[in-house]
Amino acid sequence: FERTRSLQDPCSNCPAGTFCDNNRNQICSPCPPNSFSSAGGQRTCDICRQCKGVFRTRKECSSTSNAECDCTPGFHCLGAGCSMCEQDCKQGQELTKKGCKDCCFGTFNDQKRGICRPWTNCSLDGKSVLVNGTKERDVVCGPSPADLSPGASSVTPPAPAREPGHSPQ
């Protein structure tokens, strides 16, 4: 089949990184600078994407693949091809499909990315809440009431929160 196709269409022999040049008797010509063809048999090369402004180059364009962009610090990509940049959320927020939203009561996020996580449940470890949680900070667990006798050790570190998921893109 490949051989038949080649006989019918000489352009099918042109590999990625080239185009079938009708102006030169359908010879396979290399893609000009700042252009690429990612598949064989193409009659034109595509213009390389330029990462400008808030977009910065993550991967340079080559003759066989387009450039890839990401966003400058403080911003993150939206979409598979990073077609838009969105400001990172503040601490105490999480990224949802509708943008940055404050953490619900009982949850926190101490980073500018990721999701809001539930406050540590001190009572599960037989401890009491020493410092209340906020949208930005987890609760601090202290010794249980029974441990508050003289000579008992003071604050224990909070139990590890559950692993944060990935923010939606």
């Epitope: 400008k52 402004g53 077609s83 838009m84 940049c85 969105e86 499909k97 509708k98």
Partner: antibody, heavy 116, light 107 residues
Framework: QVQLVQSGAEVKKPGASVKVSCKAS????????MHWVRQAPGQGLEWMGA????????DYNQKFKDRVTMTRDTSISTAYMELSRLRSDDTAVYYC?????????WGQGTLVTVSS | DIQMTQSPSSLSASVGDRVTITCRAS??????LNWYQQKPGKAPKLLIY???RLHSGVPSRFSGSGSGTDFTLTISSLQPEDFATYYC?????????FGGGTKVEIR
Amino acid sequence: QVQLVQSGAEVKKPGASVKVSCKASGYTFAGFEMHWVRQAPGQGLEWMGAIDPKTGGTDYNQKFKDRVTMTRDTSISTAYMELSRLRSDDTAVYYCARDLGYFDVWGQGTLVTVSS
Amino acid sequence: DIQMTQSPSSLSASVGDRVTITCRASQDIRSNLNWYQQKPGKAPKLLIYYTSRLHSGVPSRFSGSGSGTDFTLTISSLQPEDFATYYCQQSEKLPRTFGGGTKVEIR
């Protein structure tokens, strides 16, 4: 806060040129493309082009390619849009806008009136 | 160039009404669609970007949906301050292009 402040209204004669400025504040000017959009009286929005302040590179709408020049002065965080050979149908409000793939901040607009 | 067609071009509605504006692209623009609100004598304001993401400070009664070529802006319960003109705009390819606008007027 992030702000774009444009130069004041202009009245020009047909055939003349106009240069509108757009001063950015509250963010790193060189880090975002600046786009220009115009709106004729009672009409919709029309994209004119963009400049990358970091490099000075431009993209123009084919419709304006031979008449528009976009420049910038990074030392004063200002972008400029110059339109030459003005015609009466260039009478419009000209806006600059910061780009993130969407225009999140706009200037207040500059009315350019072309009249003999 | 990618053509953006908005409908209706104008509509009359009352406070509390649910309002839907549609925008159609002449080719696939994935989710690269933004919505702006403009009031007379003022610059446009970003409402929604990337089809459905609400810009900061925009009330949650505004929502966006769609993908590919067909998109919708919905105002769940129209408020007095929502009477304005709304524009869609694609960011898939240069030149950036806008829809013709939809003017939302008081019935």
